[in-house]
Amino acid sequence: MAVTACQGLGFVVSLIGIAGIIAATCMDQWSTQDLYNNPVTAVFNYQGLWRSCVRESSGFTECRGYFTLLGLPAMLQAVRALMIVGIVLGAIGLLVSIFALKCIRIGSMEDSAKANMTLTSGIMFIVSGLCAIAGVSVFANMLVTNFWMSTANMYTGMGGMVQTVQTRYTFGAALFVGWVAGGLTLIGGVMMCIACRGLAPEETNYKAVSYHASGHSVAYKPGGFKASTGFGSNTKNKKIYDGGARTEDEVQSYPSKHDYV
């Protein structure tokens, strides 16, 4: 019962986490224009992994994709790679974990196989979560470095009469979504690994029983079974765990005068 709950909960938590990682990867607000201690501009700049956007005070938003691969910073490419690896591993982990769930019966699949699949998916979720956390952290570090560099530039080279507005970027919503989602996927993976231990049968201890024959004193140990190192069948009562997660993605479109795609 506890094993099923742990496995089911791990699956749901991981599902939410991976949905979050996907959402974070697709979001445009990885970095947003820093408004603190800056002139109030009538435009608001924000950037994602795939495109940069400008929202004007008029309400119109214009987004432009990064159409170059070679021209992009290596760090950005690395973050993209980490997030994609995280999503792929997470998606495979979800697929594997669906078949591993104790509440789902697939043919005559033994619990030993389910335990192995649960462990595999758990590890995949852990690695997926770590990839997402690493990706987001690398991007955050890049932002912090650039922020202080641009801050230094703001206070140097101001000798000329004409001032230039230095756009500084700070943490966007996607970073927080990514950190939380990565953490949830990681937690889900750990829960799956814990559930896997519960699915493995404990060593069956058979007490030696002495049978005294009328004429002989012979000690008889039944079976002489050796403790199996494999995963035996679990004869505990099974409770159906119905844990489903539903995610809805809302995409707001803005009016656009020109098509930049």
Partner: antibody, heavy 117, light 113 residues
Framework: QVQLQESGPGLVKPSQTLSLTCTVS????????ISWVRQPAGKGLEWLGE???????NYNSALKSRVSISKDNSKSQVFLKLSSVQAADTARYYC???????????WGQGTLVTVSS | DIVMTQSPDSLTVSLGERATINCKSS????????????LTWYQQKPGQPPKLLIY???TRESGVPDRFTGSGSGTDFTLTISSLQAEDVAVYYC?????????FGPGTKLEIK
């Protein structure tokens, strides 16, 4: 078609509050921001402030303490209030629709406001 | 506040000739996010509200004749009328649409010689 029409009292006494209404048609205030601009006779244009689609506002710092802009989306109306008016506030007041590049693509005909006792 | 200056104050040009109006801002109007200059040009004829000619420093508003051209970047901008027509007699204003408050230039009065 897109239209903007300013309305309000043509004469306001000094130290009183000037209240103007901009009624729009042909578009929704939930999709477009509105800006207020004034022009004293024979002089240049002065930006007063704007109200965004979500209801947020930004005002000219020179008038910040005196100017207030609000709107009623259902009535397609935008309101300008300018308190403690003086003779220097005598001007033609325009409302305009914000478009690409934060430019004003449509303007009302303007309403002339005279501040005098 | 950004100070917008226009030159000349008034301009007299013959019909069919080229007219050039300059606008200078005290701060750059270039937005690094989209590499666009947030400067707008308006035309105002006597007794009428201003009319939008150019936005983003060089993008012509729909319906505006192609003899009107906007150029420039950063702090220096130019409005050019390639072949002056009688109906172009008006006052021309440039506007900062980048940093609040969104200030206007003092205007340039264009007349026919």
């Amino acid at each position: 078609q897109v239209q903007l029409q300013e309305s309000g009292p043509g004469l306001v006494k000094p130290s009183q509050t000037l209240s103007l209404t901009c009624t729009v048609s042909g578009f929704s205030l939930t999709s477009y921001a509105i800006s207020w601009v004034r022009q004293p006779a024979g002089k240049g244009l002065e930006w007063l402030g704007e109200i965004w689609t979500g209801g947020g506002t930004n005002y000219n710092s020179a008038l910040k303490s005196r100017v207030s802009i609000s709107k009623d989306n259902s009535k397609s109306q935008v309101f300008l209030k300018l308190s403690s008016v003086q003779a220097a506030d005598t001007a033609r007041y325009y409302c305009g629709r914000l478009s690409y590049g934060n430019s004003l693509d449509y303007w009302g005909q303007g309403t002339l406001v005279t501040v005098s006792s | 506040d950004i100070v917008m200056t226009q030159s000349p104050d008034s301009l007299t040009v013959s019909l069919g000739e080229r007219a050039t109006i300059n606008c200078k801002s005290s701060q750059s109007l270039l937005n690094s996010g989209n590499q666009k200059n947030y400067l707008t040009w308006y035309q105002q004829k006597p007794g009428q509200p201003p009319k939008l000619l150019i936005y983003w420093a060089s993008t012509r508003e729909s319906g505006v004749p192609d003899r009107f051209t906007g150029s420039g970047s950063g702090t220096d901008f130019t409005l050019t009328i390639s072949s002056l027509q009688a109906e172009d007699v008006a006052v021309y204003y440039c506007q900062n649409n980048f940093i609040y408050p969104l200030t206007f230039g003092p205007g340039t009065k264009l007349e026919i010689k």
